[in-house]
């Protein structure tokens, strides 16, 4: 239409930039690779590495896993997004009593308030619930049937997690794992146990906190202890170790008190998106056939993606690029075309950049 | 240099139906989108549907949903839009553009447009 054409020359020869007709504006075309952050991107910032399927990219522009919420008791808050991890909390009925980055690392059951004593403030995914003593006038026979199961000697104002111990299981509150399913279902409509000599879960100026041995008066070598699959990051915080789940990852390093597992590509592979302690994408080792060429390209980032050699021209295996890893090799009558998720694809020439997913698929490198 | 060429398009009863096709040659950038847009003498271009060629997630425009369906044939590389129980007030000159899914939203860029294909109704 007449009325593009004074705007639409404004972009014309200059390759880094494109008219949209749509909005009207010369807008900035993101290198191969990168992903625009909004409709008309206008410099090189509004341009992002895009991680592969629930990973996040981070302050520090790595793709780093986001947190899984896959434990009996967490739910998810906020979902794995492009540039922010996913969030989990306590489910419902539950509390956190030591919290992780972006999780929690051991949930509660909210405490039942004792006879005599009323809900001051429900329990909620990060506190437990707090008691007070009944108004006078109100029969500790009962104001509720929730808050009145059976009589108590002494008067507390916060009702006490207390784990289930060796001689009982009527306890209204248990730290609950990843694999235990909830045989304490019904636990938050039980009264406390009897107080026990464990401290587990206990009200204290630092939840979690627990000595790595006995703790002698005035030692220092009480620090933090993080559950199972947890460990104690720079900050101090409790956060979860990698998984190496997945078919293509094998553990190289376990998770530690103070260190996350690591996690390499297995036997075979070779990681070509890298992400925090462990490997965002891994791709075969090449196997070089005669109608393949392997090629790291120019990028914006240190992925390495191959192409297929121009019809007729001679393949020149090369297995280590200059990044140091080895690429895979692509069939130049196999090229997809797809995005991130690897899911639906078109086909596209055989001089565009490809990569092998972990499925061993042709994945056109989106970073 | 990657080009999109429109085809499809006519002229057709009220009621009727067309079907327009755009093939994608050259490369295209993954994770990415294809739509057609549309113009009237005299209006503003009118975003009609779209679909993201890796997921197959399919997006439309208000006026059309329902009518339209947008779809993609991957071994042809091509996107097409059934039209279906057309309107006077759908002639217009039909647009197909490509471009990527922006991050963290279903909007895509528009970075690539083909010439155009007419589609006119008549009451």
């Known amino acids: 239409f007449p009325q593009d054409r004074p705007f639409e020359d404004t972009c014309h020869g200059n390759p880094s930039h494109y008219y949209d007709k749509a909005v009207r504006r010369c807008c900035y075309r993101c290198p191969m690779g990168l992903f625009p952050t909004q409709q008309c991107p206008q410099r090189p910032t509004d341009c992002r590495k895009q991680c592969e399927p629930d990973y996040y990219l981070d302050e520090a522009d790595r793709c780093t896993a986001c947190v899984t919420c896959s434990r009996d008791d967490l739910v998810e808050k906020t979902p794995c997004a492009w540039n922010s991890s996913r969030v989990c909390e306590c489910r419902p009925g539950m509390f956190c009593s030591t919290s992780a980055v972006n999780s929690c690392a051991r949930c509660f059951f909210h405490s039942v308030c004792p006879a005599g004593m009323i809900v001051k403030f429900p329990g909620t995914a990060q506190k437990n619930t707090v008691c007070e003593p009944a108004s006078p006038g109100v029969s500790p026979a009962c104001a509720s049937p929730e808050n009145c199961k059976e009589p108590s000697s002494g008067t507390i104002p916060q009702a006490k997690p207390t784990p289930v111990s060796p001689a009982t299981s009527s306890a209204s509150t248990m730290p609950v794992r990843g694999g235990t399913r909830l045989a304490q279902e019904a636990a938050s409509k039980l009264t406390r146990a009897p107080d026990s000599p464990s401290s587990v879960g206990r009200p204290s100026s630092d939840p979690g906190l627990s000595p790595t041995q006995p703790c002698p008066e005035g030692s220092g070598d009480c620090r933090k202890q993080c559950e199972p699959d947890y460990y104690l990051d720079e900050a101090g915080r409790c956060t979860a170790c990698v998984s190496c789940s997945r078919d293509d990852l094998v553990e190289k390093t376990p998770c530690a008190w103070n260190s996350s597992r690591t996690c390499e590509c297995r036997p075979g592979m070779i990681c070509a998106t890298s992400a925090t302690n462990s490997c965002a994408r891994c791709v075969p080792y090449p196997i070089c056939a005669a109608e393949t060429v392997t090629k790291p390209q120019d990028m914006a980032e240190k992925d390495t993606t191959f192409e297929a050699p121009p019809l007729g021209t001679q393949p020149d295996c090369n297995p280590t690029p200059e990044n140091g890893e080895a690429p895979a090799s692509t069939s130049p009558t196999q090229s997809l075309l797809v995005d991130s998720q690897a899911s639906k694809t078109l086909p596209i020439p055989t001089s565009a950049p490809v990569a092998l997913s972990s499925t061993g698929k042709p994945v056109l490198d989106a970073g | 240099q990657v080009k999109l060429v429109e085809s499809g398009g006519g002229s057709v009863q009220a009621g009727g139906s067309l079907r327009l096709s755009c093939a994608a040659s050259?490369?295209?950038?993954?994770?990415?989108?294809m739509g057609w847009f549309r113009q009237a003498p005299g209006k503003e271009r009118e975003w009609v549907a779209r679909i993201h060629t890796g997921s197959g997630s399919t997006y439309y425009a208000d006026s059309v949903k329902g009518r339209f369906t947008i779809s993609q044939d991957n071994a042809k590389n091509t996107v097409y839009l059934q039209m279906n129980s057309l309107r006077p007030e759908d002639t217009a000159m039909y647009d197909c553009a490509a471009g990527r899914v922006v991050l963290g939203a279903v909007v895509c860029t528009n970075e690539y447009w083909g010439q155009g294909t007419q589609v006119t109704v008549s009451s």
């Open positions: 050259g490369y295209i950038y993954s994770s990415n989108c």
